[in-house]
């Protein structure tokens, strides 16, 4: 239904707290350099305006679209050109071009310092003084660093944060209560961010149809007892929600997500037997819970997939009558039978099936042609299964840090032109797949590994797009989203690369490394490892291990020395010489 005032409608639906949070996220994602105070001022102005519209929907400007209202606010910011350069040109455009322009200027890798967590005592003091401002800072800092973070989900993480602080700040040992809990939230939020970015990439590059196919596969795996019409309805609604969030329409997105959660809870009987626990929770927790609810039990009497999609004489007729519906049904039927496959794999199989029908249905004897299609799926299924086995075996042998290093070597060889910080970030993230997925039961490993890797590689592609340097990466990133991971896996050493000169300063370290937290120490060592590979792309694993062991020993010795500075300045050059010799 049409509302006289869109802003009043959303304010009423969402309530003041969520309304303000979402407007803050929207502004922080669009203008990533502005301070919290600048954004908080705009949010208050927008909220005050929304309240006047709630009181009188016919008041001046209340009939304007949200894009117009928000865009006008952003464009009124002083010194916009000085701080944001060409983004200010967006303000010369009319809606909807202005909003599109803002979206195009979102920066996936803003030059902002890492979000440092204050020490426990200070955190608790500022939280107790003003919980609202404290949580506002959290929303602002996360949103500006992750301009595509799924807004209603960020509100959920803020709520988690709030609950942890409320609980831990009342404890005697605040630090040991806060640290593991907040680390857990941070880890989950970072994974949520890369997953959502992947969804937005899918939507931006390949349109709603591609996202809807993803949704059909995912929902069919989770709700195998729901019929195709129900899955299609859920996929259509979920596509709308994600389209809105990816497009910066955060109020509509959060409102529609709440509606979808409500619908699911009112229709549990036709969707899944596993929803009740989620449906008993308050809104943000309910929607989050539904998004990661466990798979329902598969119906026991499902016929073989071949019956309708291979053996039936009507295959080509059904395909001709409604291509998308027929392929959608195939994806639904295959996915509900395979919760043990990744969504990426299911989409590759559907694509293979579509290509087979395109070819075979044009032949004089189609059934003889498409009769072997399921057998042709086998290599497509075996490839990711082998990937999971090989990588989980390696992870179990090396542990997370060692596994990250193995991946770092592999990816630096595949794309040595990529900047070292990007390679290290990618390898560290890709390496976390071991901890995240390899400990799961066998039937959950493949979907966990491949869909997580795909999301991380999407980030690699986004960063590479800004400054393309590797033909290998460009090739893998320009194909379809579901083919990226197999493409990267298949890359070998880049033979076109001219090795980097050996620079002693790259491998020169100082005593300040000793006081760094373990994570930062690892990053320093991994940076050196990537640089070594860039210097000697064909170095053997054994050579690299020798050098890295020597390096670790050097750090250990010098960090324990009484005079650390002297140790680093005398032993450092020796280390560099030994490294050169070992790699000669």
């Amino acid at each position: 239904e049409a509302h006289k005032s869109e802003i009043a409608h959303r304010y009423n639906d969402l309530g003041e707290q969520h309304f303000k949070g979402l407007v803050l996220i929207a502004f922080s994602q669009y203008l990533q350099k502005c301070s919290y105070d600048e954004h908080a001022k705009l949010v208050q102005e927008v909220t005050d305006f929304a309240k006047t519209c709630v009181a009188d929907e016919s008041a001046a400007n209340c009939d304007k679209s949200l894009h117009t209202l928000f865009g006008d606010k952003l464009c009124a910011i002083p010194n916009l050109r000085e701080n944001y350069g060409e983004l200010a040109d967006c303000c010369t455009k009319q809606e909807p071009e202005r909003n599109e322009c803002f979206l195009q200027h979102k920066d996936d890798n803003p030059s902002l310092p890492p979000f440092e967590r204050p020490e426990a005592e200070a955190m608790c003091t500022s939280f107790k003084e003003n919980p609202t401002t404290f949580m506002g800072h959290y929303l602002h800092e996360v949103a500006r660093r992750h301009p595509y973070f799924y807004a209603p989900e960020l509100l959920y993480y803020a709520e988690q944060y709030n609950e942890i602080l409320t609980q831990c700040c009342a404890e005697a040992d605040k630090e040991s209560c806060l640290t593991p809990k907040l680390d857990g939230v941070k880890e989950k939020a970072l994974v949520s961010s890369v997953r959502q970015r992947m969804k937005c990439s899918s939507m931006q590059k390949f349109g709603e149809r591609a996202f809807k196919a993803w949704a059909v596969a995912r929902l069919s795996q989770t709700f195998p007892n729901a019929d195709f019409a129900e899955i299609t309805k859920l996929a259509t609604d979920l596509t709308k929600v994600n389209k809105e969030c990816c497009h910066g329409d955060l109020l509509e997105c959060a409102d529609d997500r709440a509606e979808l959660a409500k619908y699911m809870c009112e229709n549990q009987a036709t969707i899944s037997s596993k929803l009740q626990t989620c449906c008993d929770k308050p809104l943000l927790k309910k929607a989050h819970c539904l998004s990661e609810v466990e798979h329902d039990t598969m119906p026991a009497d499902l016929p073989a997939i071949a019956a309708d999609f291979v053996e039936d004489q009507e295959v080509c007729k059904n395909y001709a009558e409604a291509k998308d519906v027929f392929l959608g049904t195939f994806l639904y039927e295959y996915s509900r039978r395979h919760p043990d496959y990744s969504v990426s794999l299911l989409l590759r199989l559907a694509k293979k099936y579509e290509a087979t029908l395109e070819k075979c249905c044009a032949e004089a004897n189609p059934p003889a042609c498409y009769g072997t299609v399921l057998a042709e799926f086998q290599p497509l299924v075996e490839e990711p299964k082998n990937l999971v086995k090989t990588n989980c075996d390696l992870y179990e042998k090396l542990g997370e840090y060692g596994f990250q290093n193995a991946i770092l070597v592999r990816y630096t060889q595949k794309a040595p032109q990529v900047s070292t910080p990007t390679l290290v970030e990618a390898a560290r993230n890709l390496g976390r797949v071991g901890t995240k997925c390899c400990t799961l039961p066998e039937d959950q490993r493949l979907p966990c590994v491949e869909d997580y890797l795909s999301a991380i590689l999407n980030r690699v592609c986004l960063l590479h797009e800004k400054t393309p340097v590797s033909e290998h990466v460009t090739k893998c990133c320009s194909g379809s989203l579901v083919e990226r991971r197999p493409c990267f896996s298949a890359l070998t050493v880049d033979e076109t690369y001219v090795p980097k000169e050996f620079k002693a300063e790259t491998f020169t370290f100082h005593s300040d490394i000793c006081t760094l937290p373990e994570k930062e120490k690892q990053i320093k060592k991994q940076t050196a490892l990537a640089e070594l590979v860039k210097h000697k792309p064909k170095a053997t694993a054994e050579q690299l291990k020798t050098v890295m062991d020597d390096f670790a020993q050097f750090l250990d010795t010098c960090c324990k020395a009484a005079d650390k500075d002297t140790c680093f300045s005398t032993e450092g050059p020796n280390l560099v010489t030994r490294c050169k010799d070992a790699l000669a």
Epitope: Q313, K317, A320, E321, A364
Partner: nanobody
Framework: GVQLLESGGGLVQPGGSLRLSCAAS????????MSWVRQAPGKGLEWVSS????????LYADSVKGRFTISRDNSKNTLYLQMNSLRPEDTAVYYC????????SSQGTLVTVSS
């Protein structure tokens, strides 16, 4: 949706000829192989002939080989069946179908071969 409309049937003497047409709409005609199937009074459905989307490949049932010719005009979205040397046992309702389908969803056209 998909529509198939057969025409050209009628009464013909043994040894005579007929040309059946099938006008197709609602799908990308040139992307699909097409077939003719027939059903004689009181009998089951019998496959007659098939042609690929480009028209380069054709297949015939042994019972009609050498007498019938299947063809298509993709610019007109039309399928044809040229039937020569007709026999009484060719009497049937003829249907055009998509791909290897042995089910019909159209009216068909009646061919009667009788003296």
């Amino acid at each position: 949706g998909v529509q198939l409309l057969e025409s050209g049937g009628g009464l013909v003497q043994p040894g005579g000829s007929l040309r059946l047409s099938c006008a197709a709409s609602g799908f990308t005609f040139s992307s699909f192989g097409m077939s003719w199937v027939r059903q004689a009074p009181g009998k089951g459905l019998e496959w007659v002939s098939s042609i690929s989307g480009t028209g380069s490949d054709t297949l015939y049932a042994d019972s009609v080989k050498g007498r019938f010719t299947i063809s298509r005009d993709n610019s007109k979205n039309t399928l044809y069946l040229q039937m020569n040397s007709l026999r009484p046992e060719d009497t049937a309702v003829y249907y055009c179908t998509i791909g290897g389908s042995l089910r019909y969803s159209s009216q068909g056209t009646l061919v009667t071969v009788s003296s």
